[in-house]
Protein backbone atom coordinates (compact mmCIF):
# COMPACT_ATOMS: atom_id res chain seq x y z
CA UNK A 1 0.00 0.00 0.00
CA UNK A 2 2.82 2.37 0.84
CA UNK A 3 4.24 2.20 -2.70
CA UNK A 4 0.87 2.89 -4.32
CA UNK A 5 -0.19 6.28 -5.59
CA UNK A 6 -1.06 8.35 -2.53
CA UNK A 7 -2.53 11.83 -2.30
CA UNK A 8 -3.10 14.15 0.62
CA UNK A 9 -4.79 17.44 -0.24
CA UNK A 10 -6.13 20.00 2.19
CA UNK A 11 -7.77 23.40 1.77
CA UNK A 12 -8.49 26.21 4.19
CA UNK A 13 -11.83 27.98 3.86
CA UNK A 14 -10.15 31.21 5.09
CA UNK A 15 -11.95 31.21 8.47
CA UNK A 16 -12.21 28.13 10.74
CA UNK A 17 -12.21 25.00 8.59
CA UNK A 18 -9.51 22.89 6.95
CA UNK A 19 -10.96 20.17 4.72
CA UNK A 20 -8.72 17.24 3.78
CA UNK A 21 -8.87 14.33 1.34
CA UNK A 22 -6.58 11.34 1.71
CA UNK A 23 -6.33 8.67 -0.96
CA UNK A 24 -4.12 5.63 -1.19
CA UNK A 25 -4.29 2.84 -3.75
CA UNK A 26 -4.31 -0.56 -2.13
CA UNK A 27 -5.43 0.69 1.27
CA UNK A 28 -8.18 -1.30 2.94
CA UNK A 29 -11.59 0.36 3.06
CA UNK A 30 -11.95 -0.28 6.79
CA UNK A 31 -8.56 1.23 7.68
CA UNK A 32 -8.97 3.69 10.54
CA UNK A 33 -7.17 6.97 9.83
CA UNK A 34 -7.27 10.53 11.12
CA UNK A 35 -5.81 13.94 10.36
CA UNK A 36 -4.03 15.79 13.14
CA UNK A 37 -3.36 19.54 12.97
CA UNK A 38 -0.48 21.06 14.93
CA UNK A 39 -0.09 24.85 14.44
CA UNK A 40 3.28 26.51 14.90
CA UNK A 41 2.00 29.53 16.85
CA UNK A 42 -1.35 28.55 18.32
CA UNK A 43 -2.21 26.76 21.55
CA UNK A 44 -4.77 24.42 20.04
CA UNK A 45 -4.39 21.06 18.29
CA UNK A 46 -7.21 19.54 16.29
CA UNK A 47 -8.05 16.07 14.99
CA UNK A 48 -10.68 14.71 12.61
CA UNK A 49 -11.52 11.16 11.63
CA UNK A 50 -11.12 10.34 7.95
CA UNK A 51 -14.33 8.80 6.61
CA UNK A 52 -14.60 6.89 3.30
CA UNK A 53 -15.91 8.83 0.32
CA UNK A 54 -14.97 6.28 -2.36
CA UNK A 55 -13.12 2.99 -2.82
CA UNK A 56 -9.69 4.36 -1.84
CA UNK A 57 -10.45 7.88 -0.70
CA UNK A 58 -11.25 9.39 2.71
CA UNK A 59 -12.17 12.91 3.80
CA UNK A 60 -12.63 14.96 6.94
CA UNK A 61 -13.04 18.51 8.21
CA UNK A 62 -10.86 20.08 10.86
CA UNK A 63 -13.23 22.43 12.67
CA UNK A 64 -11.03 25.10 14.26
CA UNK A 65 -13.74 27.21 15.88
CA UNK A 66 -16.96 29.11 15.23
CA UNK A 67 -17.69 29.29 11.48
CA UNK A 68 -16.94 33.01 11.11
CA UNK A 69 -13.99 33.20 13.52
CA UNK A 70 -10.58 34.03 12.03
CA UNK A 71 -8.50 31.14 13.36
CA UNK A 72 -5.43 31.42 11.10
CA UNK A 73 -3.45 34.17 9.37
CA UNK A 74 -1.06 34.42 6.46
CA UNK A 75 1.95 33.77 8.69
CA UNK A 76 0.60 30.59 10.28
CA UNK A 77 1.97 27.17 9.46
CA UNK A 78 -0.08 24.14 10.45
CA UNK A 79 1.66 20.78 10.38
CA UNK A 80 -0.87 18.24 9.16
CA UNK A 81 -0.36 14.53 9.73
CA UNK A 82 -2.29 11.51 8.46
CA UNK A 83 -2.22 8.81 11.13
CA UNK A 84 -3.52 5.31 10.39
CA UNK A 85 -4.06 2.55 12.89
CA UNK A 86 -1.79 -0.47 12.48
CA UNK A 87 -2.67 -3.00 15.13
CA UNK A 88 -2.43 -1.31 18.50
CA UNK A 89 -0.47 1.76 17.38
CA UNK A 90 -0.92 4.72 15.04
CA UNK A 91 1.47 5.10 12.11
CA UNK A 92 2.23 8.45 10.48
CA UNK A 93 1.52 8.05 6.76
CA UNK A 94 1.83 11.64 5.55
CA UNK A 95 3.12 14.96 6.87
CA UNK A 96 2.76 18.44 5.41
CA UNK A 97 3.73 21.89 6.67
CA UNK A 98 0.53 23.51 5.49
CA UNK A 99 0.35 27.23 4.74
CA UNK A 100 -3.37 28.01 5.01
CA UNK A 101 -3.39 31.09 2.78
CA UNK A 102 -1.52 29.26 0.01
CA UNK A 103 -4.19 26.54 -0.04
CA UNK A 104 -7.54 28.32 -0.10
CA UNK A 105 -10.93 27.04 -1.16
CA UNK A 106 -13.82 29.17 0.00
CA UNK A 107 -17.33 27.99 0.78
CA UNK A 108 -19.80 28.12 -2.11
CA UNK A 109 -21.64 31.46 -2.48
CA UNK A 110 -25.04 31.56 -0.78
CA UNK A 111 -28.30 33.52 -0.78
CA UNK A 112 -28.67 33.63 -4.55
CA UNK A 113 -31.72 35.64 -5.54
CA UNK A 114 -33.35 37.22 -8.54
CA UNK A 115 -33.24 40.99 -8.10
CA UNK A 116 -35.08 41.79 -11.31
CA UNK A 117 -36.24 39.77 -14.28
CA UNK A 118 -37.44 40.83 -17.74
CA UNK A 119 -38.10 39.07 -21.02
CA UNK A 120 -34.45 39.02 -22.14
CA UNK A 121 -32.58 39.95 -18.97
CA UNK A 122 -32.20 38.84 -15.39
CA UNK A 123 -30.30 40.52 -12.55
CA UNK A 124 -29.06 38.09 -9.90
CA UNK A 125 -27.24 38.73 -6.63
CA UNK A 126 -25.47 36.47 -4.09
CA UNK A 127 -23.35 36.57 -0.96
CA UNK A 128 -20.03 35.01 -0.01
CA UNK A 129 -19.97 32.81 3.06
CA UNK A 130 -17.30 32.53 5.77
CA UNK A 131 -14.76 34.52 3.75
CA UNK A 132 -11.91 36.24 5.55
CA UNK A 133 -11.86 40.02 5.81
CA UNK A 134 -8.16 39.76 4.82
CA UNK A 135 -9.17 39.44 1.17
CA UNK A 136 -10.77 42.90 1.13
CA UNK A 137 -11.78 43.04 -2.54
CA UNK A 138 -9.26 40.52 -3.88
CA UNK A 139 -11.74 37.92 -5.05
CA UNK A 140 -12.99 36.77 -8.44
CA UNK A 141 -16.13 34.90 -9.50
CA UNK A 142 -17.22 32.52 -12.22
CA UNK A 143 -20.86 32.10 -13.18
CA UNK A 144 -22.76 29.85 -15.55
CA UNK A 145 -26.33 29.63 -16.79
CA UNK A 146 -28.09 26.41 -17.68
CA UNK A 147 -30.26 26.76 -20.77
CA UNK A 148 -32.98 24.28 -21.76
CA UNK A 149 -31.62 21.21 -23.54
CA UNK A 150 -28.06 21.76 -22.36
CA UNK A 151 -25.87 20.45 -19.52
CA UNK A 152 -23.90 22.43 -16.94
CA UNK A 153 -20.69 21.30 -18.60
CA UNK A 154 -21.80 22.90 -21.87
CA UNK A 155 -22.63 26.22 -20.22
CA UNK A 156 -20.16 28.99 -21.08
CA UNK A 157 -18.31 30.44 -18.09
CA UNK A 158 -18.76 34.12 -17.29
CA UNK A 159 -15.78 35.57 -15.43
CA UNK A 160 -16.03 38.47 -12.99
CA UNK A 161 -12.49 39.63 -12.28
CA UNK A 162 -13.45 41.64 -9.23
CA UNK A 163 -15.49 41.34 -6.05
CA UNK A 164 -18.88 41.84 -7.69
CA UNK A 165 -21.71 39.98 -6.02
CA UNK A 166 -24.26 40.42 -8.77
CA UNK A 167 -24.62 39.85 -12.48
CA UNK A 168 -26.94 40.97 -15.23
CA UNK A 169 -27.63 38.10 -17.63
CA UNK A 170 -28.60 39.31 -21.09
CA UNK A 171 -29.78 37.91 -24.44
CA UNK A 172 -32.08 35.45 -22.69
CA UNK A 173 -35.13 33.91 -24.36
CA UNK A 174 -38.56 35.09 -23.18
CA UNK A 175 -40.74 32.79 -21.08
CA UNK A 176 -37.91 30.29 -20.57
CA UNK A 177 -36.76 28.39 -17.50
CA UNK A 178 -33.07 28.80 -16.60
CA UNK A 179 -30.76 27.85 -13.76
CA UNK A 180 -27.79 29.84 -12.52
CA UNK A 181 -24.68 29.01 -10.45
CA UNK A 182 -21.70 30.98 -9.21
CA UNK A 183 -18.38 30.16 -7.53
CA UNK A 184 -15.64 32.25 -5.93
CA UNK A 185 -11.85 32.23 -5.69
CA UNK A 186 -9.37 34.43 -3.81
CA UNK A 187 -6.52 35.84 -5.89
CA UNK A 188 -4.04 34.77 -3.18
CA UNK A 189 -2.34 31.39 -2.86
CA UNK A 190 -0.14 29.07 -4.91
CA UNK A 191 -2.54 26.13 -4.59
CA UNK A 192 -5.76 28.09 -4.16
CA UNK A 193 -8.71 26.70 -6.12
CA UNK A 194 -12.31 27.56 -6.93
CA UNK A 195 -15.02 27.09 -4.33
CA UNK A 196 -17.70 24.51 -5.08
CA UNK A 197 -20.51 25.79 -7.26
CA UNK A 198 -23.39 27.40 -5.42
CA UNK A 199 -26.74 25.69 -5.19
CA UNK A 200 -28.49 26.37 -8.51
CA UNK A 201 -30.97 29.23 -8.62
CA UNK A 202 -33.96 28.55 -10.89
CA UNK A 203 -35.69 31.47 -12.60
CA UNK A 204 -37.99 32.11 -15.54
CA UNK A 205 -37.86 35.03 -17.92
CA UNK A 206 -41.05 36.99 -18.50
CA UNK A 207 -43.13 36.17 -21.55
CA UNK A 208 -42.97 38.57 -24.46
CA UNK A 209 -45.92 40.95 -24.58
CA UNK A 210 -48.44 39.82 -27.21
CA UNK A 211 -48.30 41.79 -30.42
CA UNK A 212 -45.17 43.67 -29.36
CA UNK A 213 -41.68 43.29 -30.74
CA UNK A 214 -39.38 42.91 -27.75
Amino acid sequence: AVNGTSQFTCFYNSRANISCVWSQDGALQDTSCQVHAWPDRRRWNQTCELLPVSQASWACNLILGAPDSQKLTTVDIVTLRVLCREGVRWRVMAIQDFKPFENLRLMAPISLQVVHVETHRCNISWEISQASHYFERHLEFEARTLSPGHTWEEAPLLTLKQKQEWICLETLTPDTQYEFQVRVKPLQGEFTTWSPWSQPLAFRTKPAALGKDT
Epitope: A1, V2, N3, G4, T5, S6, F8, T9, Q24, W38, D40, I77, T79, R81, V82, R91, V92, M93, A94, I95, Q96, D97, F98, K99, E102, G189, E190, F191
Partner: nanobody, 127 residues
Framework: QVQLVESGGGLVQAGGSLTLSCAAS????????KAWFRQAPGKEREFVAA????????DYADSVKGRFTITRDNAKATVHLQMNSLKPEDTAVYYC????????????????????WGQGTQVTVSS
Protein backbone atom coordinates in the same frame (compact mmCIF):
# COMPACT_ATOMS: atom_id res chain seq x y z
CA GLN B 1 12.91 26.58 -13.98
CA VAL B 2 13.95 25.08 -10.65
CA GLN B 3 17.48 23.69 -10.49
CA LEU B 4 18.86 21.45 -7.74
CA VAL B 5 22.62 21.03 -7.34
CA GLU B 6 24.10 18.45 -4.96
CA SER B 7 27.54 18.65 -3.39
CA GLY B 8 29.56 17.02 -0.61
CA GLY B 9 29.96 13.53 -2.00
CA GLY B 10 33.25 11.67 -1.91
CA LEU B 11 35.19 8.66 -0.70
CA VAL B 12 35.01 7.79 3.00
CA GLN B 13 35.93 4.82 5.15
CA ALA B 14 33.30 2.66 6.80
CA GLY B 15 32.21 4.22 10.09
CA GLY B 16 33.03 7.70 8.82
CA SER B 17 30.78 10.69 8.16
CA LEU B 18 29.82 12.93 5.26
CA THR B 19 27.44 15.83 4.83
CA LEU B 20 25.66 16.28 1.51
CA SER B 21 24.15 19.62 0.50
CA CYS B 22 21.53 20.51 -2.07
CA ALA B 23 21.15 24.07 -3.31
CA ALA B 24 17.96 25.15 -5.08
CA SER B 25 17.78 28.01 -7.55
CA UNK B 26 15.67 29.37 -10.39
CA UNK B 27 12.32 29.43 -8.63
CA UNK B 28 10.57 28.91 -5.34
CA UNK B 29 7.49 27.15 -4.07
CA UNK B 30 5.50 28.34 -1.09
CA UNK B 31 5.79 25.13 0.90
CA UNK B 32 7.73 22.44 -0.94
CA UNK B 33 9.18 19.25 0.52
CA LYS B 34 12.69 18.11 -0.29
CA ALA B 35 14.16 14.63 -0.18
CA TRP B 36 17.24 12.57 -0.80
CA PHE B 37 17.16 9.41 -2.92
CA ARG B 38 20.05 7.14 -3.84
CA GLN B 39 20.89 4.69 -6.57
CA ALA B 40 23.56 2.00 -6.25
CA PRO B 41 25.01 0.36 -9.39
CA GLY B 42 22.56 -2.14 -10.86
CA LYS B 43 19.83 -1.22 -8.37
CA GLU B 44 16.69 0.89 -8.45
CA ARG B 45 16.61 4.41 -7.08
CA GLU B 46 15.53 4.29 -3.44
CA PHE B 47 14.19 6.78 -0.93
CA VAL B 48 16.57 7.91 1.83
CA ALA B 49 15.05 10.85 3.74
CA ALA B 50 12.62 13.75 3.34
CA UNK B 51 11.78 16.99 5.12
CA UNK B 52 8.76 19.30 5.09
CA UNK B 53 8.97 22.99 4.20
CA UNK B 54 9.33 24.33 7.75
CA UNK B 55 11.29 21.30 8.91
CA UNK B 56 8.55 20.28 11.33
CA UNK B 57 8.29 16.84 9.76
CA UNK B 58 10.94 14.36 8.62
CA ASP B 59 10.81 10.83 7.24
CA TYR B 60 13.62 8.27 6.96
CA ALA B 61 14.08 4.92 5.27
CA ASP B 62 14.52 2.16 7.86
CA SER B 63 18.03 1.45 6.53
CA VAL B 64 19.31 4.93 7.52
CA LYS B 65 17.19 5.74 10.58
CA GLY B 66 19.37 6.79 13.50
CA ARG B 67 22.42 7.29 11.27
CA PHE B 68 21.31 9.99 8.82
CA THR B 69 19.79 13.39 9.62
CA ILE B 70 18.05 15.65 7.11
CA THR B 71 17.82 19.42 7.75
CA ARG B 72 17.02 22.49 5.69
CA ASP B 73 17.85 26.19 5.66
CA ASN B 74 15.11 28.03 3.78
CA ALA B 75 16.98 31.36 3.96
CA LYS B 76 19.76 29.80 1.88
CA ALA B 77 17.47 27.46 -0.09
CA THR B 78 19.56 24.48 0.93
CA VAL B 79 18.93 20.99 2.30
CA HIS B 80 21.57 18.95 4.10
CA LEU B 81 21.97 15.24 4.72
CA GLN B 82 24.31 14.44 7.61
CA MET B 83 25.45 10.84 7.19
CA ASN B 84 27.12 9.13 10.14
CA SER B 85 28.31 5.54 10.76
CA LEU B 86 28.52 5.01 7.03
CA LYS B 87 28.51 1.44 5.68
CA PRO B 88 29.75 0.03 2.37
CA GLU B 89 26.09 -0.58 1.42
CA ASP B 90 25.53 3.19 1.55
CA THR B 91 27.68 3.50 -1.59
CA ALA B 92 25.53 5.10 -4.30
CA VAL B 93 24.80 8.23 -6.28
CA TYR B 94 22.72 10.51 -4.01
CA TYR B 95 20.03 12.67 -5.60
CA CYS B 96 18.18 15.67 -4.22
CA UNK B 97 14.50 15.97 -5.18
CA UNK B 98 11.68 18.48 -4.69
CA UNK B 99 7.94 17.94 -4.25
CA UNK B 100 6.09 21.26 -4.81
CA UNK B 101 3.01 20.06 -2.94
CA UNK B 102 5.07 19.56 0.19
CA UNK B 103 3.77 16.19 1.44
CA UNK B 104 6.17 13.57 2.82
CA UNK B 105 5.83 10.32 4.77
CA UNK B 106 5.83 6.56 4.20
CA UNK B 107 3.02 6.90 1.64
CA UNK B 108 5.06 9.46 -0.33
CA UNK B 109 8.42 7.75 -0.70
CA UNK B 110 7.82 6.88 -4.33
CA UNK B 111 9.96 8.96 -6.69
CA UNK B 112 6.88 9.83 -8.78
CA UNK B 113 5.84 12.32 -6.08
CA UNK B 114 8.93 14.42 -6.87
CA UNK B 115 8.92 16.79 -9.82
CA UNK B 116 12.42 18.28 -9.77
CA TRP B 117 15.71 16.39 -9.49
CA GLY B 118 19.40 17.17 -9.22
CA GLN B 119 22.16 15.48 -11.20
CA GLY B 120 23.45 13.54 -8.20
CA THR B 121 26.66 13.28 -6.18
CA GLN B 122 28.69 10.09 -5.73
CA VAL B 123 29.24 8.66 -2.26
CA THR B 124 31.65 5.75 -1.93
CA VAL B 125 32.16 3.96 1.38
CA SER B 126 35.18 1.67 1.48
CA SER B 127 35.57 -1.18 3.91
Amino acid sequence: QVQLVESGGGLVQAGGSLTLSCAASGGAFSSDAKAWFRQAPGKEREFVAAITWAGRGTDYADSVKGRFTITRDNAKATVHLQMNSLKPEDTAVYYCALNPRGVIGPAFRNSNHYTYWGQGTQVTVSS
